[in-house]
Interface confidence: low
Amino acid sequence: PHLRTFTDHFQTCKVQGAWPLIDNNYLNVQVTNTPVLPGSAATATSKLTIIFKNFQECVDQKVYQAEMDELPSAFADGSKNGGDKHGANSLKITEKVSGQHVEIQAKYIGTTIVVRQVGRYLTFAVRMPEEVVNAVEDRDSQGLYLCLRGCPLNQQIDFQAFRANAESPRRPAAASPSPVVPETFPYETAVAKCKEKLPVEDLYYQACVFDLLTTGDVNFTLAAYYALEDGKMLHSNKDKLHLFERTRELPGAVAAAA
Amino acid sequence: CKILKCNSEFWSATSSGSHAPASDDVPEFCAALRTYALCTRRTARTCRGDLAYHSAVHGIEDLMSQHNCSKDGPTSQPRVRTLPPAGDSQERSDSPEICHYEKSFHKHSAAPNYTHCGLFGD
């Protein structure tokens, strides 16, 4: 999946299986990523687990679990708030669109989380205070916390190299290792589809093009669009909303704030 | 143990906003508390040792004494809860300040710096 980190780095990761997205004293978020097509390096999020840890007079431990085709509007125990403590309503889950869009507000840690199902896969977005982001017991063990550190270099897909190939007249086989992708989805069509929803040619737009060329699944256009929309709602600095690629000096680590 | 059901029914019956009951609401509030107490008694056998259950029982006793509610008296009819418009606070009036990050943060310093992380697509 594509990852925008807390430090506004933008990466395309091929991480497969379960990976920690956030792991701090208050909150644990884990995603499970699966290959989008047989033989493809590209993966998308098929499962998401959020654990809100027990906190003072505010909330009991609450677990939220979403999977493909199952986006619940309640925590695993059936509740919609933080439990039975005085401040239980400082954690609240709201269904925005049934089966498609859920928002979780954790006021006790100043955090808002948006989970969506777009097509077959899940998207995740969070707004969190720096103080909460950095509230970790043991800094040394936080190496693979994706939202903070990003993906390991060997798990990143070189977005720009892919794009350079895709822009050439014939699409190389490497761009799409799976025969399932329809040959009738040329680069120009992908660009047109993405331009419709994402008029600014930023990294969300580039991600959209990459996804369409890799999978042929137009739902990924919406995934990029909603990721940007959620960013508009959740990012505190509107000037940094659109990310643009750096020059070619940084292989594998595409991005940073404009 | 159906304590969560008792809790949610009580909150539904009493969440008319973020304020404590006004003096003319007290009879209604006491009736809701008595209903809450009745609900906890009905589920008592299956809730032995459940911390949420014992917290509720203590909480009811505290609220009954705070609002001078008599143990005997009318109970409230369960009512369908109408959700407040989006953006309205549904936080209980006794929610500690520590459970509202921004409120407790502003006491000590300027507004917090927020960060954003997102994951999408392939």
Partner: antibody, heavy 120, light 109 residues
Amino acid sequence: EVQLVQSGAEVKKPGASVKVSCKASGYTFTSHGISWVRQAPGQGLDWMGWISPYSGNTNYAQKLQGRVTMTTDTSTSTAYMELSSLRSEDTAVYYCARVGSGPYYYMDVWGQGTLVTVSS
Amino acid sequence: QSALTQPRSVSGSPGQSVTISCTGTSSSVGDSIYVSWYQQHPGKAPKLMLYDVTKRPSGVPDRFSGSKSGNTASLTISGLQAEDEADYYCYSYAGTDTLFGGGTKVTVL
């Protein structure tokens, strides 16, 4: 250094009450809960309950309901556990422990223990 | 009767590995990230060894590790040393007030 220092050993008669104190230092007292745990001679650990110094909220073990009272004094950063109607089976070492983040979370700092002997 | 079941005793020679299990229910162990482990030497207060199933507080040697599978949490001591001989207790919140396991005596042969 984070420390919990408990009051000294007590000998009580059946039917009496005992009040054990636990003085905290080295951290913000109201930021963590205090749990009380006891251990009868040769037996395992037995959770008695929890108190939040921040709000005074308590959770007591079912079997001790009505006999145990936990309180705190934030001005002196001290937690208290009072057990009434003592019986011989209450003979135990009583520990206070700081709770990491909430009532049921891990106990990261422990007091040295207070031996309470109930004997006629 | 404890809601968390531990073996009464385990033993091993110095340098060997031993594993202590702690079996509960789905709510007490299976779905919980709050399993912690305590070491207690005779006549001493318990000491936190692991929390959140796998995390080690500073000062605890890395030969102590934790894991969880289904409704069973485990504490493993690899490279057993003489000073590891003690009682070990697991602890978890289960929605009830029986939170400690019965304890396991670890003997270093």
